[in-house]
Amino acid sequence: KAMHVAQPAVVLASSRGIASFVCEYASPGKATEVRVTVLRQADSQVTEVCAATYMMGNELTFLDDSICTGTSSGNQVNLTIQGLRAMDTGLYICKVELMYPPPYYLGIGNGTQIYVIDPEPCPDSD
């Protein structure tokens, strides 16, 4: 079943290469287990950047070598992606799955365009 997911259209990463955005989903029921995946769509590729499964009210547990961290509050997930560089600029899509209890729901956001600007190197001081 389909579910609406909202996320900001544009986010500018910090000078330290950190970008944060909120992914909000309109839960049709009372899900207890939720899976959130961040997809990057750019360069004619789709990459699952990070994924987390969490029980409502608990911390997000990210899978694998995650460059993401996050917290949840109700139907909102606050996501942070770290270590970004200019080449990582692209469309970052939030995908939310309500895993339990049935029925299964899937929602995919329209994406957040994350812009990353590499900091200028400090000029040499004499």
Epitope: T47, E48, V49, C50, L63, D64, D65, L84
Partner: nanobody, 125 residues
Amino acid sequence: EVQLVESGGGLVQTGGSLRLSCAASGRTFSNYTMGWFRQAPGKDREFVAAISRSGSLKAYADSVKGRFTPSRDNAKKMAYLQMNSLKPEDTAVYYCAAAPVPWGTRPSLFPYDSWGQGTQVTVSS
């Protein structure tokens, strides 16, 4: 580095399926992100798909998304590429590659330092 040997290529008709295998030996396989690339005659080598060290995260070229799926079995030191709904434009030599790095946003550009010898996939119309 790890040593990689591919198998599973062959001749298949349009719409058919193949499963490529990549056997690794040497260093700890689970320390490597695995990628799949292909090179068609007269063309540059291009990224096809990749899979993270534990197998939980994947990446795909737009041209194969929904048709190709990478997977891995760390206990067996094996990586796989399941290819469905094959098209003539999928004809190429397919290579598996290993990168000793964690996952990130651009796995197509990871420093793959180990490559297999390649396996030919031919899709006839």
